[in-house]
């Protein structure tokens, strides 16, 4: 019995005086508490309280449930206690089929003893299975056997208590242990599409999906910049043990404009927490809008190629294109094409490939698309470079020389004079009249030039040279003038091409 | 053993909120399931939700999503669950129970409590 | 939500009769079925769990089978204590039950 200095309360004195006390089943139990200021008896055994306020406890015939912890408390607060153990060979474990462990912590298998003075007092698998390798426990008597360190792995195993009584192993009832698992990592969450596009009065439906350990994981949809509730729907699996998943779907059945925004879906457990965004745009009605992915204006030289290609984003999808030139549809040379799979793709590619283009095929080029609620268009003009041709050259009876030459971009005519059987001809001669001939025409085929020099200025035998070029190349042609007294001859002329 | 002792029997007007509550005598009630499950007369049963009060989230049914509220109260070993808007057709018998999340079966009931609706 | 579909929705038996009730998932629910005993005015009482375990306590003559969708409960020969409603129920989706069988004295 404990020893207190004089003068301070002291704890009550129990008889019998022991920690511990083994009766037999059907024996009677007699506890007295010494105490001047006695208030109660408290009897405690798995979860389990009585209560007595009589100083002297007394069960006259005692039986396995009767083994427990006997405390006499004071008015002091002050208690003292004895263990009584009710040996009772056809009840060895006091049992609470309960059994609950949280993850890397310790849990008790409750199934203390009657008899402290059994063996082998341990815990074994059900049905002669072995316990996992790495199920670590501790045995105490009074309280049970202590699992230390419960592992998921243990969810759902099968357990009894075990001792060994006149060399024959006694079992307990069957224990299931349920395993709550610790949050080691914040929840997965991911959203079913990234972005939306709608038009006012279509419904906005989006789902999260939340994957954790457990179903008690925290998740809600949030509007970004605002506390209002959204309105959510759920639906949940376990796709067994530790393994669960939550679809969150967020509906708003006719969007309007201003429900554009970001909305996130947020979840969290006791390790920490994630999201995830999604953004809607409204719009009040659908739209296309081009992009050259070229200028619109194109030069292009004679036989070569070239594509006009264009971006466009259409909402919702296009459902017409058509490239159009000189009043004609193309049917093909064109292919169009999503700018990506993505489900949510607004963004779309056109292109049409012009080949070995001719001199009299620039024009105006125009891409058309429709949707269910606009039309689009975007115009290339293409000018098609071409040498210059020379057209006529001739001497005229006013006794001028003209050259008329067509060509892309406009050619420009030079004239020389070479004297004798020169070959090459240097001296230039300035012209007396130069003329576009076509500019108030269409501006994408070839343009015309005249050009015209007095012959009347050459004294000499000797040849004019009509050199036409421009950016793509050159085109020359020749005069010969011959002398026979005091008469001009033309003689032949003649082009030559000079790359 | 342990055991789930349940509030007693209440009668409310339509439009108002029962709040009933279950205490659970001794075990790890931290780490239970503790879930709610209804029986109107003469019906079956029904599940509204549950709480595991460790964790602190409560998982609703949809049907009740909105209207039912499940909390825990550790330090007394006590579940509650609050049901608002009370209709006629919410005149059931309210059961708590052990388990019914993350798989788990009930396998303790409370004795239940009549909720009778009625103006 | 997963529907629970008990058959028969009431049957009457004699004391010693074997007694089966079956309970359809519309949906596959692995292992996670429960059957449940529930007596007039009582709560329910757990019988078997996970589809085929006994509950302690549960007499032997209780038996569950099946997985996926199709479940059965057995009840090899029927005693006078016997004769109650019996619920299954699925814990993989927000729980349901089944509509329950009612045993009746023939």
């Known amino acids: 019995q404990p020893s207190v200095s004089p003068g301070e309360p002291s704890p009550p004195s129990i008889h019998p005086g022991k920690s511990d006390l083994i009766v037999r089943v059907g024996d009677e139990i007699r506890l007295l508490c010494t105490d001047p200021g006695f208030v109660k008896w408290t009897f405690e055994i798995l979860d389990e309280t009585n209560e007595n306020k009589q100083n002297e406890w007394i069960t006259e015939k005692a039986e396995a449930t009767n083994t427990g912890k006997y405390t006499c408390t004071n008015k002091h607060g002050l208690s003292n206690s004895i263990y009584v153990f009710v040996r009772d060979p056809a009840k060895l474990f006091l049992v609470d089929r309960s059994l609950y462990g949280k993850e890397d912590n310790d849990t008790l298998v409750r199934c203390p003893l009657t008899d402290p003075e059994v063996t082998n007092y341990s815990l074994k698998g059900c049905q002669g299975k072995p316990l996992p390798k790495d199920l670590r426990f501790i045995p105490d008597p009074k309280a049970g056997i202590m699992i230390k360190s419960v592992k998921r792995a243990y969810h759902r195993l099968c357990l009894h208590c075990s001792v060994d009584q006149e060399g024959k192993s006694v079992l307990s009832e069957k224990f299931i242990l349920k395993v709550r698992p610790a949050f080691k990592a914040v929840p997965v969450v991911s959203v079913s599409k990234a972005s939306y596009l709608l038009r006012e009065g279509e419904e906005f439906t989006v789902t999260c999906t939340i994957k954790d350990v457990s179903s008690s994981v925290y998740s809600t949809w949030k509007r970004e910049n605002s506390q209002t509730k959204l309105q959510e729907k759920y639906n949940s699996w376990h796709h067994g043990d530790f393994n669960y998943e939550r679809q969150a779907t967020l509906t708003i059945s006719s969007a309007r404009v201003n429900d554009s925004g970001v909305f996130m879906c947020y979840a969290n457990n006791t390790f920490g927490s994630a999201n995830v965004t999604t953004t809607l745009e409204v719009v009040d009605k659908g739209f296309i809008n081009i992009f050259p992915m070229i200028n619109t204006t194109v030069f292009v030289n004679d036989g070569e190629n070239v594509d006009l290609i264009v971006e466009y984003e259409a909402f919702p999808k296009p459902e017409h294109q058509q490239w159009i030139y000189m009043n004609r549809t193309f049917t093909d040379k064109w292919e169009d094409y999503p700018k990506s799979e993505n489900e949510s793709n607004i963004r779309y590619v056109s292109e049409l490939h012009l080949t070995r283009l001719k001199g009299t095929e620039g024009g105006t080029y125009t891409f058309l698309v429709s949707n269910s609620d606009v039309n689009a268009a975007i115009a290339f003009n293409v000018y098609v470079n071409t040498k210059p041709e020379i057209l006529t050259y001739d001497r005229l009876v006013n006794g001028m020389l003209q050259c008329v030459a067509a060509g892309f971009p406009e050619p420009t005519i030079d004239w020389y004079f070479c004297p004798g059987t020169e070959q090459r001809c240097s001296a230039s001669v300035l012209p007396v009249d130069v003329q576009t001939l076509n500019s108030s025409g269409p501006p994408f085929g070839k343009l015309v030039v005249q050009s015209s020099i007095d012959s009347s200025a050459f004294k000499h035998n000797g040849t004019v040279e009509c050199k036409a070029y421009n950016d793509v190349g050159k085109t020359s042609a020749y005069f010969n003038f011959a002398f026979k007294g005091n008469n001009k001859e033309q003689i032949h002329p003649h082009t030559l091409f000079t790359p | 053993q342990v055991q789930l002792v349940q509030s007693g029997a209440e009668v409310k007007k339509p439009g108002s909120s029962v709040k009933v509550s279950c205490k659970a005598s001794g075990g790890t009630f931290r780490i239970y399931a503790i879930s709610w499950v209804r029986q109107a007369p003469g019906q079956g049963l029904e599940w509204m939700g549950g709480i595991i009060p460790d964790f602190g989230v409560a998982n609703y049914a949809q049907k009740f999503q909105g209207r039912v509220t499940i909390t825990a109260d550790e330090s007394t070993s006590t579940a509650y669950m609050e049901l608002s808007s009370l209709r006629s057709e919410d005149t059931a018998v309210y059961y708590c129970?052990?388990?019914?999340?993350?798989?788990?079966?009930?396998?303790?009931w409370g004795r239940g409590t009549l909720v009778t609706v009625s103006s | 939500d997963i529907q629970m579909t008990q058959s028969p929705s009431s049957l009457s038996a004699s004391v010693g009769d074997r007694v089966t009730i079956t309970c359809r998932a519309s949906?596959?629910?692995?292992?996670?079925l429960n059957w449940y005993q529930q007596k007039p005015g009582k709560a329910p009482k757990l019988l078997i769990y996970a589809a085929s375990s006994l509950q302690s306590g549960v007499p032997s003559r209780f038996s569950g089978s099946g997985s996926g969708t199709d479940f059965t409960l057995t009840i090899s020969s029927l005693q006078p204590e016997d004769f109650a409603t019996y619920y299954c129920?699925?814990?993989?989706?927000?729980?349901?039950f089944g509509g329950g069988t009612k045993v009746e004295i023939k």
């Open positions: 949906q596959s629910i692995n292992s996670y």
């Open positions: 129920q699925q814990g993989v989706s927000d729980i349901t």
């Open positions: 129970a052990r388990g019914g999340l993350d798989t788990d079966e009930f396998d303790l």
